[in-house]
Interface confidence: medium
Amino acid sequence: GPVPPSTALRELIEELVNITQNQKAPLCNGSMVWSINLTAGMYCAALESLINVSGCSAIEKTQRMLSGFCPHKVSAGQFSSLHVRDTKIEVAQFVKDLLLHLKKLFREGQFN
């Protein structure tokens, strides 16, 4: 059956931790992505932002995991209203911001 939301979120957090704590050089060669609003539809928005980064094996697992949280198919170039379209940040900062937000959600028991 499907993985319980709390387990899936924990696994996503663990993967984001592995990425952020393991940097010896700028993540994805310092690639820039659109910032997002960390609100209700953030999983799809995060995937829409990160899917535009190609050739970066470090975030491929994260992209796959985020797709499991997003109910619709996401492809490169697709954007939702959740993006702050005038702000681009480095992938490393994007991933860390996402990690810190998800940690708070997990601690508060907001698994979905």
Epitope: I13, V17, T20, Q21, Q23, P26, A92, K96, L100, K103
Partner: antibody, heavy 122, light 108 residues
Framework: QMQLVESGGGVVQPGRSLRLSCAAS????????MHWVRQAPGKGLEWVAD????????HYADSVKGRFTITRDNSKNTLNLQMNSLRAEDTAVYYC???????????????WGQGTMVTVSS | SYVLTQPPSVSVAPGQTARITCGGN??????VHWYQQKPGQAPVLVVY???DRPSLIPERFSGSNSGNTATLTISRVEAGDEADYYC???????????FGGGTKLTVL
Amino acid sequence: QMQLVESGGGVVQPGRSLRLSCAASGFTFRTYGMHWVRQAPGKGLEWVADIWYDGSNKHYADSVKGRFTITRDNSKNTLNLQMNSLRAEDTAVYYCARAPQWYLVAEPFDLWGQGTMVTVSS
Amino acid sequence: SYVLTQPPSVSVAPGQTARITCGGNLIGSKLVHWYQQKPGQAPVLVVYDDSDRPSLIPERFSGSNSGNTATLTISRVEAGDEADYYCQVWDSSSDGVVFGGGTKLTVL
């Protein structure tokens, strides 16, 4: 209230062994990762070892690898540190500390014991 | 293994702002925690995850982290803030915890 109490410290000769214990109370011990951290007199903090909430994984600082063993008994709410082949440079106050376990690494130490002094001297 | 560099000492007058730095390669990507240790006492967590504060810690304590430097800021410093302060991260390459060397905060 939540508490960690270390015991087992003392004076020991180089090459000898010592076993430290840390008794936990006031919280659900089995859900927390646990660590040992030491502090030599007048020096800074040095991480020694950690053990996952269920005892399934353990990690050690290079300086103690092969000599120290960390264990826990969740039924008794106790953390242990078996220290063998002790050296003068192991002289320090040894603290046990807990870390929220829910994603295993990079968590802060939110509760510390008061420490137990270990002196290695001939 | 990963190295964290802190200034040995920082001095500040009461009521002023103290800033204690913690340097490390790309530390901005890591989660940094800060501890306060007073003489003869165990360390106490004052800031975690770069900038979050445990419930019993005053709002005067704050943290930031970007690039190669994390900073603990103590505003409106009081005599009771005099202590050693340590930064801490997790080092994935060694699967272990790393502490900075510590900074002694002196309140003039």
